[in-house]
Interface confidence: low
Amino acid sequence: GITIPRNPGCPNSEDKNFPRTVMVNLNIHNRNTNTNPKRSSDYYNRSTSPWNLHRNEDPERYPSVIWEAKCRHLGCINADGNVDYHMNSVPIQQEILVLRREPPHCPNSFRLEKILVSVGCTCVTPIVHHVA
Amino acid sequence: GITIPRNPGCPNSEDKNFPRTVMVNLNIHNRNTNTNPKRSSDYYNRSTSPWNLHRNEDPERYPSVIWEAKCRHLGCINADGNVDYHMNSVPIQQEILVLRREPPHCPNSFRLEKILVSVGCTCVTPIVHHVA
């Protein structure tokens, strides 16, 4: 029978019907011109699940610098400013696309790579496992 | 700084500086093989600043499907399960790279594009402006 093609949002690297090599113009078009440049820059401090931003640098990757969020506490900050361990600070992770130089050190040849980054933290109710 | 020698097996490039147009292999390498596949998938419901995920689809973009977080409430969920408007649910936004077909409808020609996406929500203390 005929296989229904996979949704193009989930490309299959083994799929023969997906182009292997393409030309990419690195002159970035930024579609965020109307957004507030400060955006969520102060949320990391004001959140009930605050986080620190760590610089992850890799010259073989484009972009070479990515900022990773690390939650400051296991718990969340309560109204008194104390850490409440009945709640959990957890990282919100997202898969993003980056370009990886391939072969290594090549100036104009890349492979798409999917990496998981932590963007910030949120406060969640813990999953409680009751012992029978 | 130390210059990394160019790999002799690299494709030829006319641009001696940072390349404008590069070759990209779309056979995605996924570096997240050791991560928990569930990841943060249930955080959107368990968070004190819960969010819904909206599908953003654009066939001229790669990836063509991106999920956008929209915070459910203006306030945050308190210990009683009610919305507390003394706190604010805010989206955590991240700039990500996508590929945009250029010229439009071309099968193997893209431009890098930076777009702002909301990944999830976090609960923050509001900024209170005191009137003098």
């Epitope: 005929i2 229904i4 093609p5 949704n7 193009p8 949002g9 019907n17 182009p19 030309m23 | 689809e57 654009d58 066939p59 063509s64 499907v65 010229p103 439009p104 409808h105 071309c106 099968p107 193997n108 020609s109």
Partner: antibody
Framework: EVQLVESGGGLVQPGGSLRLSCAAS????????IHWVRQAPGKGLEWVGW????????NYADSVKGRFTISADTSKNTAYLQMNSLRAEDTAVYYC????PDMWAMDYWGQ | DIQMTQSPSSLSASVGDRVTITCRAS??????VAWYQQKPGKAPKLLIY???FLYSGVPSRFSGSGSGTDFTLTISSLQPEDFATYYC?????????FGQGTKVEIK
């Protein structure tokens, strides 16, 4: 199974109108482009136009511009070709065809 | 509009023959070329896309090559079911345009 089923063809007088339908099934309609391509008796293939059901964007061949309109109803997964001011040279078999964005060729055609 | 010129317009060949059809674009179309097979009374079927990628389910005796302005469809060993008309098509710019077709007949 991916399917495109055309309907609505018939005999019409010069200057008349006709609406063709292309019912799609077995795939995400909004993730594709739908093309209309025609073939006059004993002749080759001629592209008529396309639509992105996702955005509603359309594009037409010069030979039909202003006379033909392509539309889509995403709730019905159906594309339409409205043909007005028909001429003798529009006599042809009309095919609808699907184009997935990550291939840019027409991989499924109606019959 | 970009013109796609196919040659020959028709050819006679025998089962087992190697058949080559060429397509020339009036301007550079990178590798944005597809090849289709059409039998009488039937809709076209995709064989090759992006100049050289074999579409799934298409026998490996079909191959495509080329970039820029010159493209080739090759059938390495002609089979009885391959007697049909073949079209090239560019999708580099709007409007997409087809070649005039090459009819492959039994010798």
């Amino acid at each position: 199974e991916v399917q495109l089923v055309e309907s609505g063809g018939g005999l019409v007088q010069p200057g008349g109108s006709l609406r063709l339908s292309c019912a799609a099934s077995g795939f995400t309609f909004t993730s594709t482009a739908i093309h209309w391509v025609r073939q006059a008796p004993g002749k080759g293939l001629e592209w008529v136009g396309w639509i992105y059901p996702y955005s509603g964007n359309t594009n037409y061949a010069d030979s039909v511009k202003g006379r033909f309109t392509i539309s889509a109803d995403t709730s019905k997964n159906t594309a339409y070709l409205q043909m007005n001011s028909l001429r003798a040279e529009d006599t042809a078999v009309y095919y609808c065809a699907r184009q997935v964005p990550d291939m840019w060729a027409m991989d499924y055609w109606g019959q | 509009d970009i013109q796609m010129t196919q040659s020959p317009s028709s050819l006679s060949a025998s089962v087992g023959d190697r058949v080559t059809i060429t397509c020339r674009a009036s301007q550079d179309v990178s590798t944005a070329v597809a090849w289709y097979q059409q039998k009488p009374g039937k809709a076209p079927k995709l064989l090759i896309y992006s100049a050289s990628f074999l579409y799934s389910g298409v026998p490996s005796r079909f191959s495509g090559s080329g970039s820029g302005t010159d493209f080739t469809l090759t059938i390495s060993s002609l089979q009885p079911e391959d007697f049909a008309t073949y079209y090239c098509q560019q999708s580099y710019t709007t409007p997409p345009t087809f070649g005039q077709g090459t009819k492959v007949e039994i010798k």
